[in-house]
């Protein structure tokens, strides 16, 4: 059962598994949610104890029954983990705490103009977990405007104390706001040197990378595969760090793989959710339950629905036994990973999918799979929306993309002559325009936010946000697309598609079925040669075939240029302008979304 509310002046008795320090009960709840075993917690505020060393303690708790006895205690705040809930969970904490000092290892001290600058510095420093900033009013002159970057083994403070005229807060890496490079490659036959901070068992290098990503101290890893010669080290995932943040050296080793934490690009790749099945594999751990079920998918579902289950092994049924039902072993461990991995046992193993909701919805895999385009199928582009105007009569105006449960990203030029958001309707999960009838449900627009530097499409800043009046419930046919990560500046996208209901030739009409066309990106230098009369800036991105034939056209404006990278779709461009449609040597020009990520986040998270 999902319980989101906090219980004031209540202490949960017993079940303690760990104690950390957090600046608020809300943050304690997030820490509990991300801990592999925590189901309940009690947070001790200032008034709960005479002893200041006990203030801000967050006691993480577990219980077989998923509940604990409640005791009245003034100043205590208790609650439940969000593991039991179906909603999205984020580790992102943008709060700034006034007159508090979070303690840790102060490894960097520098002057900063503001707490925001200090937080940005922390976010862009590979080691930083949190910071303390001494304001202009701080009594000690030599410490004023000092920004202290801090880290700890656990990522949480070693203590929190009241301190006047300072502010404290966390790194925003988990909010996808880091400018740090994000290295996604996994390097085969490579071991990294440097310090091991921890080790866990993992079935493959990608699970090892995910574990590294949400381990607070892990910056890179080495994984010894099943074929590793030393049996005791097979499936061992070594979590590593170094002073520079990068491996000091690499060693070539057959059957070892190495890679990096994805902490600075966490929002656009699944890092919590290990959805694969591992055949002929047993995961060892503490047994929670054994249930007879039909198939390994049913076993995974059972594990996902059992809040304490972290991973499972399914033993398939013998041919004639038990109506085809096999044994489903639900398991857990202290760190969420198997204590040992055995191969060649005939079992099928995997992990709970409960943690998938800690990943951004945009990373969820969609069904596998415009001028010169072809018709799309339902659910193929679940972020694509059709924006209608009702004045003077109802018609398709522009495309757009879902980027959040209340936010649509589109082009600014779509709103020329639109006096009020009241005349706009956003239709989501639509394949054919003919589906839209008078009684078709739509989302009203609460606010149109146009970039304040926008003048006309050709001069750039052709970007706008629509805030919806109500929130979107995500389903297979309506879900967001990931924004590109700022750490991905060097990525060259090779699988890009433009979609829309726009014209199929210059003099045409809006199409009924959503069209799609695969289009290669064109360098800005090449694009500039094709548009000598315009300035192609770095805030624009171009795409098209030299020979023409496929392109976005009238009515596609505001829609997405979607590119698939590492199995995740990213919103790389917004259809903006071009000379004609699909003309030879006239690529389409799109708003380069990467350059507006800060603007988008500022507006949507204000």
């Amino acid at each position: 059962e999902c319980v989101t509310r906090l219980f004031k002046d209540i202490h949960f008795e017993g079940g303690d598994i760990a104690t950390v320090f957090t600046p608020s009960a809300k943050h304690c709840q997030v820490v509990c949610t991300h801990h592999p075993r925590c189901l309940l917690f009690t947070f001790t505020g200032e008034s709960a104890s005479e002893d200041p060393t006990q203030w801000f303690t967050c006691v993480l708790k577990d219980s077989v029954t998923e509940t604990l006895p409640r005791v009245n205690r003034t100043g205590a705040i208790s609650g439940y983990s969000f593991k039991q809930c179906s909603h999205q969970i984020s580790a992102c904490n943008k709060d700034i705490y006034v007159d508090l000092n979070m303690k840790g290892i102060n490894y960097n001290s520098s002057l900063a103009e503001s707490a925001q600058e200090c937080q940005e510095r922390c976010t862009d420093d590979v080691h930083c977990h949190f910071f303390t900033y001494a304001t202009r009013q701080f009594p000690s002159l030599e410490h004023r405007n000092i920004c202290l970057l801090k880290h700890t083994q656990t990522g949480t403070p070693t203590g929190i104390m009241k301190l006047d005229k300072v502010v404290t807060g966390f790194s925003l890496k988990s909010c996808a706001l880091s400018n740090l490079a994000c290295i996604r490659d996994v390097f085969p036959n490579t071991a990294f040197a440097d310090s091991n901070i921890d080790s866990v068992m993992a079935p493959d290098a990608f699970v090892c990378r995910r574990i590294c990503t949400h381990h607070p101290g892990c910056l890179f890893f080495t994984f010894f595969s099943q074929e590793w010669p030393k049996e005791s080290q097979r499936n061992l995932c070594l979590l590593k760090t170094s002073e520079s943040g990068l491996p000091s050296t690499r060693i070539k080793k057959s059957k070892a793989l190495s890679g990096f934490s994805l902490q600075s690009c966490r929002h656009s790749i699944p890092v919590f959710c290990h959805s694969s099945f591992y055949h002929d594999t047993d995961f060892l751990g503490e047994e929670l339950d054994i249930v007879a079920v039909k198939g390994h998918e049913a076993c995974q579902k059972l594990c996902t629905n059992a809040v304490r289950c972290q991973f499972f092994t399914y033993a398939p049924a013998q041919a004639s036994c038990n109506e085809g039902k096999g044994k489903c072993y639900l398991k857990l461990s202290s760190n969420g990973s198997p204590t040992k991995i055995l191969r060649g046992t005939g079992g099928i193993s995997g992990y709970t999918l409960r943690l998938c909701k800690m990943d951004n919805e945009c990373t969820t895999k969609i069904k596998p799979r415009i001028v010169g385009g072809t018709a799309s199928v339902r659910g193929e582009w679940p972020w694509q929306v059709t924006l209608h105007t009702t004045s003077p009569t109802q018609r398709h105006l522009c495309g757009g993309s879902i980027i959040g449960n209340q936010w649509i990203l589109t082009a600014a030029h779509c709103f020329y002559g639109v006096e009020s958001p009241k005349i706009l309707r956003v239709y989501i999960g639509i394949l054919n325009q003919s589906e839209i009838k008078e009684d078709t449900s739509f989302f009203g627009v609460q606010e149109i936010i146009i970039h304040d530097q926008y003048k006309m499409a050709e001069s750039g800043y052709d970007i706008a946000l629509l805030k919806l009046e109500t929130t979107v419930n995500y389903t297979d046919s309506q879900r967001p697309i990931c924004l590109p990560s700022k750490g991905d500046r060097n990525v060259i996208y090779t699988d890009c598609w433009v979609t829309g209901w726009g014209y199929r030739k210059l003099r045409d009409k809006i199409q009924n079925t959503l069209q799609k066309a695969k289009i290669p990106l064109v360098t800005n230098d090449e694009c500039q040669k094709r548009y000598r009369g315009h300035k192609i800036t770095h805030k624009m991105i171009c795409a098209g075939y030299r020979e023409g034939g496929k392109d976005a056209c009238k009515g596609d404006s505001g829609g997405p240029l979607s590119c698939k990278h590492n199995e995740v779709w990213h919103l790389v461009g917004i259809t903006s302008w071009g000379e004609g449609c699909a003309q030879r040597e006239r690529p389409g020009v799109y708003t380069n979304v990467l350059e507006y990520v800060d603007w988008i986040l500022e507006k949507t998270q204000a």
Epitope: I183, D185, F187, T190, I251, K252, N490
Partner: antibody, heavy 125, light 107 residues
Framework: QVQLQESGPGLVKPSQTLSLTCTVS??????????WSWIRQHPGKGLEWIGS???????YYNPSLKSRVTISVDTSKNQFSLKLSSVTAADTAVYYC?????????????????WGQGTTVTVSS | DIQMTQSPSSVSASVGDRVTITCRAS??????LAWYQQKPGKAPKLLIY???SLQSGVPSRFSGSGSGTDFTLTISSLQPEDFATYYC?????????FGGGTKVEIK
């Protein structure tokens, strides 16, 4: 097929920074299967590895030069570059760029299989 | 750093001769070794990788062997175009290091 071409000044004054660029043609620098390396050869001597870079920006340097070396990559231009600061006459050499194969498609194929023709850099006032 | 010691530093041989060059690593490098050929005024050319694998386009008279610390490059029947300097290179651990070179000269 892939070709590499070094470019940059042939003469550098002592204490200044040596800057060389290697342009990759006939293939993309954007591949996880390669590191892109700089190697130098002093007149009449053997080969000395300076450092390598992966398209992702991951770099490794020779510890004997690390404090003076920066290697960077520009995937959009299909180029990678070498900067060597505070040069002396001892940095006079032929500088080569090379592609270092790092396990192409798992067949354990390794080694520096494509080289530039080399550019002579003289450090002199 | 791993030191790579090549011997001999030069060898005089005739066309048709069998030539063997050895390379010793100061510590074990498994099979992470490559051999290169360099002619005057030219860039090195990869001959052998992974100690014994022949790079495509390289004549089969070139062969490599060894593992751990001791490695050998053999030219089974020396041809006129084989007179050059040969280098071994370890890539087991960064920094990558080369041997001092072996010059194969005409007798």
């Amino acid at each position: 097929q892939v070709q590499l071409q070094e470019s940059g000044p042939g003469l550098v004054k002592p204490s200044q920074t040596l800057s060389l660029t290697c342009t990759v043609s006939g293939g993309s620098i954007y591949s996880g299967a390669y590191y892109w390396s700089w190697i130098r050869q002093h007149p009449g001597k053997g080969l000395e590895w300076i450092g390598s870079i992966h398209y992702s920006g991951l770099t490794y340097y020779n510890p004997s030069l690390k404090s003076r070396v920066t290697i960077s990559v520009d995937t959009s231009k299909n180029q990678f570059s070498l900067k060597l600061s505070s040069v002396t006459a001892a940095d006079t050499a032929v500088y080569y760029c090379a592609r270092d194969v790092d396990d192409s498609s798992g067949d354990e194929h390794y080694g520096m299989d494509v080289w530039g023709q080399g550019t002579t850099v003289t450090v002199s006032s | 750093d791993i030191q790579m010691t090549q011997s001999p530093s030069s060898v005089s041989a005739s066309v048709g001769d069998r030539v063997t060059i050895t390379c010793r690593a100061s510590q074990g490098i498994d099979s992470w070794l490559a051999w290169y050929q360099q002619k005057p005024g030219k860039a090195p050319k990869l001959l052998i990788y992974a100690a014994s694998s022949l790079q495509s386009g390289v004549p089969s008279r070139f062969s490599g062997s060894g593992s751990g610390t001791d490695f050998t490059l053999t030219i089974s029947s020396l041809q006129p175009e084989d007179f050059a300097t040969y280098y071994c290179q370890q890539y087991h651990i960064v920094p990558i290091t080369f041997g001092g070179g072996t010059k194969v000269e005409i007798k």
